[in-house]
Interface confidence: low
Amino acid sequence: EEELQVIQPDKSVLVAAGETATLRCTATSLIPVGPIQWFRGAGPGRELIYNQKEGHFPRVTTVSDLTKRNNMDFSIRIGNITPADAGTYYCVKFRKGSPDDVEFKSGAGTELSVRAKPSAPVVSGPAARATPQHTVSFTCESHGFSPRDITLKWFKNGNELSDFQTNVDPVGESVSYSIHSTAKVVLTREDVHSQVICEVAHVTLQGDPLRGTANLSETIRVPPTLEVTQQPVRAENQVNVTCQVRKFYPQRLQLTWLENGNVSRTETASTVTENKDGTYNWMSWLLVNVSAHRDDVKLTCQVEHDGQPAVSKSHDLKVSAHPKEQGSNTAAENTGSNERNIY
């Protein structure tokens, strides 16, 4: 009679995490008598997965009834597969011996590949806000997927980005993998409503990629532009001066009026108007009693935005001229104005 062969017909078995793997094995003969054992890996460090003779293997069930005398099907099912179960499984026939059974013949092995979905990508931006024209970095991370092949793309408002670096770890063989990508994004003044999206495609996702997003509103700081103007006279000895604070983001802003360098009033932006690009406008006004001043007055609108160094804009108010004659010719009134922008 021909010598027993152990046949593992499947070179590889692909299973999604959480599912059941079927590992097929048949013997060509009932002789010699002895049990079958399943191992993961080969050599001295191999791991026992199932022993027909003895032991408790709660995740393993046999496909056929091994207690039947004529059974030659030693296929097993392993339930609730995780990436840690990946490896090559060997069906090994033992010959009955005394005191111990002796390994007789092994199958060629079946490679179990576990397909595990990547976790939802998590996108994180810089710790501190940055201003337009600056380049900021965003990171995207996803974990726990297998096999290693994965595709990651970055988008800003639907447009694919090209300036990014991606690493999949570990480099060598592993039960599961992680991906880490860093993208560089140049901010513009219009980015308050912008989104950065990290998209991960993997064979387990059946063509429906996972996405992680970050809102640039949490990253960008748009510094305000200031304009100080003198309004038409309201009363014989009063001048109304306004400070228009335009296109800033976020809303956190404090404004201080200075008269000849002395603090006149401080207020916090409250009733702001929102522009369609997401930035804000705000206006503050100061009523100056001209009769209280003998000399020209230097009015300064000083704005501290989002904890940054103050930005200021000044306006020279000529006391010598009659208020009614000053009108609202801001170009003339701003002559000699001092603009100092600190970002």
Partner: antibody, heavy 132, light 103 residues
Framework: AVTLDESGGGLQTPGGALSLVCKAS????????MGWVRQAPDKGLEFVAG???????????TYGAAVQGRATISRDNGQSTVRLQLNNLGAEDTGIYFC??????????????????????WGHGTEVIVSS | AVTQPASVSANPGETVKITCSGS???YGWYRQKSPGSAPVTLI????KRPSGIPSRFSGSKSGSTNTLTITGVQADDEAVYYC??????????FGAGTTLTVL
């Protein structure tokens, strides 16, 4: 008898595209993995592409590093043909292209054969020359 | 990567062994008599012989090394012998080839 007949070779223009067809006969085509292997002048064998029988998306096609992104392999089980399309040709694509049959195939969840380790039949080859 | 010796030589009637090492579980052996001619499969899946291949060609695997054994080498066996396998992404890999010279 198993026969694999390649066609579509010849002189090709750099930057252009080629389409090779392998007509198979003598076996149940749909049950077997198929592939393309090439040999540049005075060089060894190089795996180009493989196509599997199973519908499993992760293992339906594979490509060698030199042609990844430029090559498309497809099969028509009704016509018993396997096609290789290669774009953006360069001088390094010059060589003889062999159609191969594997000893087995894949189902959705298992394989009893791959490509380069399981070839049991080769075509005679079709020569491709990329030159201006 | 697949590693095989660049050349081996043997006298007629001797036994020659050509080794191929890599990380795969399965290997095939292919013979090419002249460059550009169609290769012939000697062994696939480690130890299987296609019909028509003489039994003096055999394949075996031990660990990560696969061996093609040719017993009773003949002058007609002069050729380049390639081993092939698959990497972890199922992409085929061929060795650089071993030239067998029959002395």
């Amino acid at each position: 008898a198993v026969t694999l007949d390649e066609s579509g070779g010849g002189l090709q223009t750099p930057g252009g595209a080629l389409s090779l067809v392998c007509k198979a006969s003598g076996f149940t085509f749909s049950s077997y993995n198929m592939g393309w292997v090439r040999q540049a002048p005075d060089k060894g064998l190089e795996f180009v592409a493989g196509i599997y029988t199973g519908s499993d998306a992760g293992l339906s096609t594979t490509y060698g590093a030199a042609v990844q992104g430029r090559a498309t392999i497809s099969r028509d089980n009704g016509q018993s043909t396997v096609r290789l399309q290669l774009n953006n040709l360069g001088a390094e694509d010059t060589g003889i292209y062999f159609c191969t049959k594997s000893a087995g195939g894949c189902s959705d969840y298992n394989c009893d054969a791959y490509i380069a380790d399981s070839i049991d039949a080769w075509g005679h080859g079709t020569e491709v020359i990329v030159s201006s | 990567a697949v590693t095989q010796p660049a050349s081996v030589s043997a006298n007629p009637g001797e036994t020659v062994k050509i080794t191929c090492s890599g990380s795969s579980s399965y290997y095939g052996w292919y013979r090419q008599k002249s460059p550009g001619s169609a290769p012939v499969t000697l062994i696939y899946d480690n130890d299987k012989r296609p019909s028509g291949i003489p039994s003096r060609f055999s394949g075996s695997k031990s660990g990560s090394t696969n061996t093609l054994t040719i017993t009773g080498v003949q002058a007609d066996d002069e050729a380049v012998y390639y081993c092939g396998n698959e990497d972890n992404s199922y992409v085929g890999i061929f060795g650089a080839g071993t030239t067998l010279t029959v002395l």
